[in-house]
Amino acid sequence: LTCLGGFASPGPVPPSTALRELIEELVNITQNQKAPLCNGSMVWSINLTAGMYCAALESLINVSGCSAIEKTQRMLSGFCPHKVSAGQFSSLHVRDTKIEVAQFVKDLLLHLKKLFREGQFN
């Protein structure tokens, strides 16, 4: 095999694969959780039926210094068509309840699994 220099860019990721990879990462987080996730940090709860990818990112991006969710943050940034920065709450129209990151991840995981089962890859 000849190396043509640099890294071959990975092929296009179908939405179904992208969603499955996010689910796998969230499963990984919940299964490997020993101590309280992100030291028990609290994040805004989101409406999982309203533009959830950007909303989830807007909520989680405010957690810093938590390596356990960095990959999730990175993946969600690719699931949102606009750039999200810490402190930005454009998609989070209602901010009234804070929950622990661990609970947020569990809720998001359950919802994404449901979408995947139903074939909703959009």
Epitope: V13, P15, A18, L19, T49, A50, G51, M52, Y53, C54, S77, G78, F79, C80, P81, H82, K83, S85, Q88, S90, S91, G119, Q120, F121, N122
Partner: antibody
């Protein structure tokens, strides 16, 4: 005032590559995703991809994954689109556009016409 | 690959209300498709009108509104004006990429 200034028209040979630029003024590109869209003559729009200029992270439409390469230079506030292995069907006007929650596809460059012909 | 379908032509009169729709071949359009509407006027003048299903871009007149109607995204022009004559493209987000519809030509007679 927000403006996106794109490079001039290009006439290129089949099989060649072309590098298009989009220089922003009135805002810092690292604060936004920059999207690229094409329009073939008298046809609709096709989304090519987007880049986060801050870290270079990209997403591409499946059909352009092996054809388009998006890059950005934050020091010159410029986004780039390289299109490779050009064929006659790649003749189109290519647009850069700024996208954010409050202004989705709100600002567009003037477009760059790329003509692929022998 | 999903296909996004729009009406090809719609005709309305000044002051009337017209609704354009955007259908996804993969099923119901949801808020996670972040439906966008872009207006094209002659000489390739593009304006983003709506993003995130119903978020009107700054400076866009209030007569333009976005929503979900049934299983489709919709753009409603309430009280159409002659200057609204244009081609309107919808774009739907599929987790990691946009797909544009083929556009609806709106004529205001």
């Amino acid at each position: 005032e927000v403006q996106l200034q794109q490079s001039g028209a290009e006439l290129v040979l089949p099989g060649a590559s072309v590098l298009l630029s989009c220089t922003a003024s009135g805002f810092n590109i690292k604060d936004y995703y920059m999207h690229w869209v094409l329009q073939r003559t008298e046809q609709g729009l096709e989304w090519i991809g987007r880049i986060d200029p801050e870290d270079g992270e990209t997403k591409y439409a499946p059909k352009f994954h092996d054809k388009a390469t998006l890059t950005a230079d934050t020091s010159s506030n410029t986004a780039y689109l390289q299109f490779s292995s050009l064929a006659s069907e790649d003749t189109a006007v290519y647009y850069c556009t700024r996208y954010d929650y409050y202004g989705p596809f709100a600002y567009w460059g003037q477009g760059t016409l790329v003509t692929v012909s022998a | 690959q999903a296909v996004v379908t729009q009406e090809s032509v719609l005709t309305t009169s000044p002051g009337e209300t017209v609704t354009l729709t955007c259908r996804s071949s993969t099923g119901a359009v949801t808020t996670s498709n972040y439906a966008n509407w872009v207006q094209e006027k002659p000489d390739h003048l593009f304006t983003g009108l709506i993003g995130g299903t119903n978020n009107r871009a700054p400076g866009v007149p209030a007569r333009f509104s976005g929503s979900l109607i049934g299983d489709k995204a919709a753009l409603t022009i309430t009280g159409a004006q002659t200057e609204d004559e244009a081609i309107y493209f919808c774009a739907l987000w599929y987790i990691n990429h946009f797909i544009f519809g083929s556009g609806t030509k709106v004529t205001v007679l």
